[in-house]
């Protein structure tokens, strides 16, 4: 680890704090051992070099120890997510030590000053961990640092400065501004802990990205592509949260990382799975639902340790609220066209029927365009567990229900004005469940009628397990 005393001088000299509070020299960071699920409880303040509070407050040396590290604050008070996370950790790990790192005085400043304070806060945590390591039975392996926003980079510094290696760091939407593209020693990075997992929920490729876009852990998970989170749109926020403003949309999306982590703690029986993929677009196309070679993982607390040579970017869809889990399906549809129809942009919908439930009518998102006489892959997801799939209804939306669809139809007509009979043929649909990895093939209910046109529907029934049909000789190639 790099020495905390470098050319910059002592870390304490680096503190960026208002002159008004420099009169009394106090540690700028406090460690509060949360001894109760009750947020009103005072907890116990731990003091470096003082063993009595550890004993008095029942610090369990052999148990897991969580350090929760908040981020930048405009209000100077602990935000409500903190209580939720503390409570969830206590619920899941009854014997664990849950420590809140209070660096509010250093975080309640201009963002740039708070950023400049992250290093010294990380050092304070490292010193606390070094002191705890002197105690019998305390092991860094059992230490899990959980940092939100700016706190994720604080955790990175702590992991960097500590003597030894902490077991795990979870970065909950690590802050982007002033960290994007930074050197690995100046931000959270995979070498800061034995396992570094990251949730990215507010990344933007345009405008200011509050959360960091680049992968910074061993696994980097981008729920809903890491940008627009369901339930955080202006309309949702206006109805359900204090302050229906852009600020609240930002807070909702940025903070979603915390709630996904809380969900993974309290809804153990409903784990959300993420799938490795090179980018969000490929995931949206449905071509990344493989679990082979560690290509899928649970998200949040239940993530399995993966220490790849390279960063692993993973994606998933979620619901708008807890429990966030959805069920992902890859749908492969081979589209035949007997007429040269030019460029065509059908608006397809599917309804899945299962042994447990039926899905709602789900849109097939066309990421680029429908390829004719080729296999097209789509991603669909349902909020409920449908059980075993039995049949699929495919609908081609008819009369335009939106200006966009009207424009699509007009464009289609302009490119092929003498082709009123738009028609495609689909003989079967191959489906793969992301959660079970089960592959199924669905055949057109009426093999004589496989054509579909605007305003029409086709029904498909399960005709076999797996994807290979009797008349197919080439083996199915597993998708990446």
């Amino acid at each position: 680890s790099p020495t905390p005393f470098g050319p910059e001088g002592q870390l304490e000299d680096e503190l960026h704090k208002p002159k008004a509070i420099q009169t009394e020299v106090k540690p700028s960071v406090r460690f509060n051992l949360r001894t109760s699920k009750d947020p009103e409880h005072e907890g116990c303040y731990l003091s470096l070099g003082h063993s009595q509070p550890l004993e008095d407050c029942g610090f369990n040396m052999t148990a897991k120890t969580f350090f929760i590290i908040h981020g930048w604050t405009m209000s100077g008070i602990f935000e409500n997510w903190l209580h939720k996370l503390v409570s969830a950790l206590h619920t899941r790990e009854k014997d664990a030590n849950v420590v809140v790192v209070d660096w509010l005085p250093l975080a309640h400043q201009l963002y740039t000053d708070a950023v400049n304070n992250t290093r010294v806060v990380g050092h304070s945590i490292a010193r606390m961990l070094d002191w705890l390591q002197e105690k019998d039975d305390f092991s860094l392996e059992n230490v899990h640092l959980i940092g939100y926003s700016l706190g994720a980079h604080v955790a990175g510094y702590a992991g960097n400065f500590v003597k030894g290696t902490v077991g795990r760091i979870t970065g909950l939407d690590p802050a982007g501004p002033m960290f994007e593209g930074a050197d690995i020693h100046k931000r959270l990075s995979p070498d800061d802990a034995d396992f570094v997992d990251v949730l990215h929920t507010y990344t933007r490729s345009f405008g200011l990205s509050i959360g960091i876009q680049m992968p910074v852990g061993h696994i980097d998970i981008y729920p809903n592509g890491g940008d627009f989170q369901p339930g955080c749109g202006l309309n949702d926020v206006l109805g359900s949260m204090a302050y229906g403003t852009i600020t609240e949309v930002v807070k909702c999306e940025h903070e979603r990382a915390v709630h996904l982590f809380v969900d993974s703690l309290v809804n153990q029986d409903k784990p959300s799975f993420a799938f490795q993929c090179t980018d969000s677009n490929r995931f949206k196309k449905g071509i990344c639902l493989s679990c082979r070679k560690n290509r899928c993982n649970s998200i949040g607390y239940n993530a399995k340790k993966m220490r790849n040579k390279r960063n692993s970017k993973m994606y998933l869809k979620t619901r708008a609220g807890m429990p966030f889990r959805v069920y992902h399906y890859q749908m492969k549809i081979h589209v035949f066209s007997y007429k040269n129809m030019g460029e065509i942009e059908p608006t397809f919908y599917v309804t899945l029927y299962g042994t447990n439930a039926d899905s709602q009518t789900l849109p097939l998102e066309i990421v680029e365009r429908i390829e004719q006489n080729a296999t097209n892959t789509f991603l669909v997801y349902t909020e409920e567990d449908l059980g075993d799939l039995l049949k699929i209804q495919l609908t081609w939306e008819g009369a335009s229900q939106s200006w966009y669809n009207l424009w699509k139809e007009l464009r289609s007509y302009l490119s092929q004005p003498h082709n009123p009979g738009r028609e495609l043929n689909i003989r079967r649909i191959r489906v793969k469940s992301g959660e079970t990895q089960r592959k199924l093939t669905f055949c057109a209910e009426d093999p004589e009628n496989t054509s579909i046109s605007p305003g029409r529907e086709l029904w498909f029934r399960k005709c076999r397990d797996g994807w290979r049909m009797k008349n197919e000789t080439s083996p199915t190639v597993e998708l990446p």
Partner: antibody, heavy 120, light 112 residues
């Protein structure tokens, strides 16, 4: 038991300065934030802001920025409210009230109030 | 800022009857299943006293005849059965994690 004891009533002239104290006992002073609340005669309660009793960082509500200052004497477990350049409209009862940093920010203990009269 | 509107401004209730006071917030004060709404009682010449926190939790030493309910933007304080000593002014107060924190205009309760 937990107590917040405030200094006695004050009679001041416009333009003068007043400093009201709030002494805490029965709990660890630095583990709870301290609020200041104004109540003009016959009027409702108005939150003025709060001070972090550990770091000394104050936060003021918009209407109380400028002439108002929160401070601490941590060794004496005491919080202070100073009002400079007093105006007639500062005539009110001022309360200190604590809240838990980790809780849901309600004010569980209040001082008895300090009545300030500003009159020429 | 979140504006809290209390109604009625005053009410008179017979001994042993129910008193109901309403508080409406200009925006939701909920967060992930919790409501950050509190109620205080203030008698003349005294400081306010915490009655209810987080919409429905009874403050320390507060008798069970006081109860709070509601979520989002609409909250209610109920006192039943009303006793002589309950004559006071009652204030609602929102304490979301984004100050400024604000109080309602108060409701004066008289006992008939």
């Amino acid at each position: 038991q937990i107590q917040l004891v405030q200094s006695g009533p004050e009679l001041k002239k416009p333009g003068e300065t007043v400093k009201i104290s709030c002494k805490a006992s029965g709990y660890t002073f630095t583990n709870y934030g301290m609020n200041w609340v104004k109540q003009a005669p016959g009027k409702d309660l108005k939150w003025m802001g709060w001070i972090n009793t550990y770091s000394g960082v104050p936060t003021y509500a918009d209407d109380f920025k400028g002439r108002f200052a929160f401070s601490l004497e941590t060794s004496a477990s005491t919080a202070y409210l100073q009002i400079n350049n007093l105006k007639n409209e500062d005539t009110a009862t001022y309360f200190c009230a604590r809240f838990s940093y980790y809780g849901r920010h309600y004010f569980d203990y209040w001082g008895q109030g300090t009545t300030l009269t500003v009159s020429s | 800022d979140i504006v809290l509107t209390q109604s009625p401004a005053s009410l008179a209730v017979s001994l042993g009857q129910r008193a109901t006071i309403s508080c409406k917030a200009s925006q939701s004060v909920d967060y992930d299943g919790d409501s950050y709404m509190n109620w205080y009682q203030q008698k003349p010449g005294q400081p306010p006293q915490l009655l209810i926190y987080a919409a429905s939790n009874l403050g320390s030493g507060i008798p069970a005849r006081f109860s709070g309910s509601g979520s989002g933007t609409d909250f209610t304080l109920n006192i039943h059965p009303v006793e002589e000593e309950d004559a006071a002014t009652y204030y609602c107060h929102q304490s979301t994690d984004d100050p400024p924190w604000t109080f309602g205009g108060g409701t004066k309760l008289e006992i008939k």
